[in-house]
């Protein structure tokens, strides 16, 4: 699951969100990690066009940093997940209304979209910026 390598982000979609010259984790479970991850972001990004102006920048940052995680180089390149607190803030504060609608539809089986990738980081499972400050990325 966490097999991959570190590389500079060379895509387009997350250019404005990720730090310039950011080292991101590219997951080798994909045949072409760069292309596959960029496609995931691109598809979800289009759906973000309809969300509120409060939610959108926060969701974009969450999306880009979740799919293109910061990478810690070393003998074993390691992805650095986003911090649980930021994840919580996006889901329950910045994007509270959107999240409710999306989760309701998902539970009722009415909805399946790339936007649901945003719920892949289950906030409670992520490291805390307070207890594990070096284990997660502050956004």
């Amino acid at each position: 699951d966490n097999k991959g390598y570190c590389a500079q982000y060379r895509g387009e979609v997350c250019n404005a969100v990720l730090a310039k010259d950011a080292l991101v984790f590219l997951n080798t479970s994909y045949a072409d990690p760069e292309e596959a991850q960029e496609l995931l972001v691109h598809t979800a990004w289009n759906e973000l066009k309809v969300v509120s102006p409060v939610c959108r920048p926060a969701a974009e940052a969450l999306l880009c940093n979740h799919i293109f995680q910061e990478c810690s180089p070393g003998v074993v390149p390691t992805p650095i997940p986003i911090c649980r607190e930021y994840c919580l803030a996006v889901k329950e504060l910045f994007c509270a209304k959107e999240w409710l609608v999306m989760e309701e539809k998902t539970h009722r089986g009415l909805y399946r979209s790339e936007m649901h990738l945003l719920s892949v980081p289950e906030c409670s499972k992520l490291p805390s910026m307070h207890w594990d400050p070096t284990a997660c990325a502050r956004l």
Partner: antibody
């Protein structure tokens, strides 16, 4: 819906201990951290500490270190705050609050603890 | 520990006034600051999250701004129900700390 229900008012003598409970419902108990905040009569809010109900790890304000213990019982979705060596200055309303700065805003109704000889 | 200094500690204002409350952190807390309102005998209620986000259900006359060490809560046009005590909270690092509060009274 999310609810945090605290135990009832307590009267204690100086030197005694008090244990306040906060029962959570309406959400997955282990997914959210719980804070304890107190407020002395006519005074401001004071952060006491936090517990992660999943692992049980805690962080306390320096002022309460050694006197406060926060625990949880996952089987009943309840967190506890025990304060020992009580003094009159500990007379306050004690609140449990979920996540505080992060996530949705939920507080218990408060528990008045009176310390008097 | 990070100290939070709120000013003023008390103020009086009239209905319709624009009111500004300031909170200063003893060190950089990025934008990890929340504002709470508390009325006598009631539980505190969050108004603003992450320095400038308006909590759902809170009237738009409330706004927050600032980052780093200087933060502001503004009420654009004071209403009768706004007379209360306001607290800032830094949630950048443990221990979290509240400002000492600003009591807003009717003039």
């Amino acid at each position: 819906q999310v609810q945090l229900v605290q135990s009832g008012a307590e009267e204690k003598k100086p030197g005694a201990s008090v244990k306040v409970s906060c029962k959570a419902s309406g959400y997955t108990f282990t997914n959210y951290y719980m804070h304890w905040v107190r407020q002395a009569p006519g005074q401001g809010l004071e952060w006491m500490g936090i517990i992660n109900p999943s692992g049980g790890n805690t962080s306390y304000a320096q002022k309460f270190q050694g006197r406060v213990t926060m625990t949880r019982d996952t089987s009943t979705s309840t967190v506890y705050m025990e304060l020992s060596s009580l003094r009159s200055e500990d007379t306050a309303v004690y609140y449990c609050a979920r996540e505080l700065g992060w996530g949705s805003d939920y507080w218990g109704q408060g528990t008045l603890v009176t310390v008097s000889s | 520990d990070i100290q939070m200094t709120q000013s003023p500690s008390a103020m009086s204002a009239s209905i319709g006034d624009r009111v500004t409350i300031t909170c200063r952190a003893s060190q950089d807390i990025s934008n990890y600051l929340a504002w709470f309102q508390q009325k006598p005998g009631k539980v505190p209620k969050r108004l603003i999250y992450v320095a400038s986000g308006l909590q759902s259900g809170v009237p738009s006359r409330f706004s927050g701004s600032g980052s780093g060490t200087e933060f502001t809560l503004t009420i654009s046009s004071l209403q009768p129900e706004d007379f209360a005590t306001y607290y800032c909270l830094q949630h950048n690092s443990y221990p979290f700390t509240f400002g000492q509060g600003t009591k807003l009274e009717i003039k």
